[in-house]
């Protein structure tokens, strides 16, 4: 999947754009908002009716090297009595993010953008059954 | 930056960290071919903490369209289909990386940007701190 060119007529390519070889793009990986701290809701992963755990995945050839993945703790959902109820199901919620992959081919190095699917948390849903006769 | 294992036979001039600026292929590699997104889009209606999806569009960003979730109710939907305010619907937020055109309007020059998105909602037990 290619990154779309700026297609809007009101965009004029500025003279200040850096020269880029064909088929590639220049990417500054100094992250904008890198140090912005977000106030996340307090331990919602444990208080949810579809609770989840976190696992950190580490890959030194990926930037960022650390990606956190959630896994639903239960198959069903936790009811008002604190017991698991399988008439409802815990399901993972996923979101795509971008990472930069560094590839070694002999002594040369290339960089590739990659979409990674991150499981962010879980929600409790009504199960659906498709019955095929 | 992060440390990269290097082939020991290669010249030692290469920096072990990711350089600040890299040239990348225009094609984005998507290794998630085994995912099945076709049915997951109805969570927002089937959840006990349902949400609406709002389109956030920015042509200076890739991806230019990001969908933001907003919880429909303060409470959660109970077994009878009514909103139960003893439980709370809360957004699940995630920091993701996107590309920002830099300098602005340039077709092939980007910078990574971290943004916070609400991906969906989950139903939680509220915490009440009583201050005497």
């Amino acid at each position: 999947r290619k990154i779309p060119k700026v297609g809007h007529t009101f965009f004029q390519k500025p003279e200040s754009c850096p020269p880029v070889p064909g088929g590639s793009m220049k990417l500054d990986i100094g992250i904008i908002n890198e140090n912005q701290r977000v106030s996340m809701s307090r331990n919602i992963e444990s208080r949810s009716t579809s609770p989840w755990n976190y696992t950190v995945t580490w890959d030194p050839n990926r930037y960022p090297s650390e990606v956190v993945q959630a896994q639903c703790r239960n198959l069903g959902c936790i009811n008002a009595q604190g017991k698991e109820d399988i008439s409802m199901n815990s399901v993972p919620i996923q979101q795509e993010t971008l990472v930069v992959r560094r590839k070694h081919q002999g002594c040369s190095v290339s960089f590739q953008l990659e979409k990674v699917l991150v499981t962010v948390g879980c929600t409790c849903v009504t199960p659906v059954i498709h019955h095929v006769q | 930056g992060i440390t990269i294992p290097r082939n020991p036979g290669c010249p030692n001039s290469e920096d072990k960290n990711f350089p600040r600026t890299v040239m990348v292929n225009l094609n984005i590699h998507n290794r998630n071919t085994n995912t099945n997104p076709k049915r997951s889009s109805d969570y927002y209606n089937r959840s006990t903490s349902p949400w609406n999806l709002h389109r956030n569009e920015d042509p200076e960003r890739y991806p230019s369209v990001i969908w933001e979730a907003k919880c429909r109710h303060l409470g959660c939907i109970n077994a009878d289909g009514n909103v139960d305010y003893h439980m709370n619907s809360v957004p699940i937020q995630q920091e993701i990386l996107v590309l920002r055109r830099e300098p602005p309007h340039c077709p092939n020059s980007f910078r990574l940007e971290k943004i916070l998105v609400s991906v969906g909602c989950t139903c939680v037990t509220p915490i009440v701190h009583h201050v005497a």
């Epitope: 399901v91 199960p127 059954i129 | 099945n36 997951s40």
Partner: nanobody, 119 residues
Framework: EVQLVESGGGLVQAGGSLRLSCAAS????????MGWFRRAPGKAREFVTL????????SYADSVKGRFTISRDSAKNAVYLQMDNLKPEDTAVYFC????????????WGQGTQVTVSS
């Protein structure tokens, strides 16, 4: 295309046991979870048990907890339901169901297998 076939139902006296089997076709069978649900005349459909395919973690409805055991055999693409200490209220048609992608959308096939518990 995955398909499931259930077997092992029958007529049994209260307190007896049955073992239901569910065989899945399809070489690349890697579901998120599988389960058994039942339909009894005049009653709502009820999930009795679920199993995570990757971890083998199990969950049961209160009505069968301690009496029913679900298990899986990854090599045979099969799930089993061991039903012990059966009660007349367990009488129903039992269906095997598969959630392929973890979205709680289950596919089931065919007529199921009839379990009848006499008192």
């Amino acid at each position: 295309e995955v398909q499931l076939v259930e077997s092992g139902g029958g007529l049994v006296q209260a307190g007896g046991s049955l073992r239901l089997s569910c065989a899945a076709s399809g070489r690349t069978f890697r579901p998120y979870r599988m389960g058994w649900f039942r339909r009894a005349p005049g009653k709502a459909r009820e999930f009795v048990t679920l199993i995570s395919w990757s971890s083998g973690r199990t969950s049961y409805a209160d009505s069968v907890k301690g009496r029913f055991t679900i298990s899986r055999d990854s090599a045979k693409n099969a799930v089993y339901l061991q039903m012990d200490n059966l009660k007349p209220e367990d009488t129903a048609v039992y269906f095997c169901a598969v959630d392929l992608s973890g979205d709680a959308v289950y596919d089931s096939w065919g007529q199921g297998t009839q379990v009848t518990v006499s008192s």
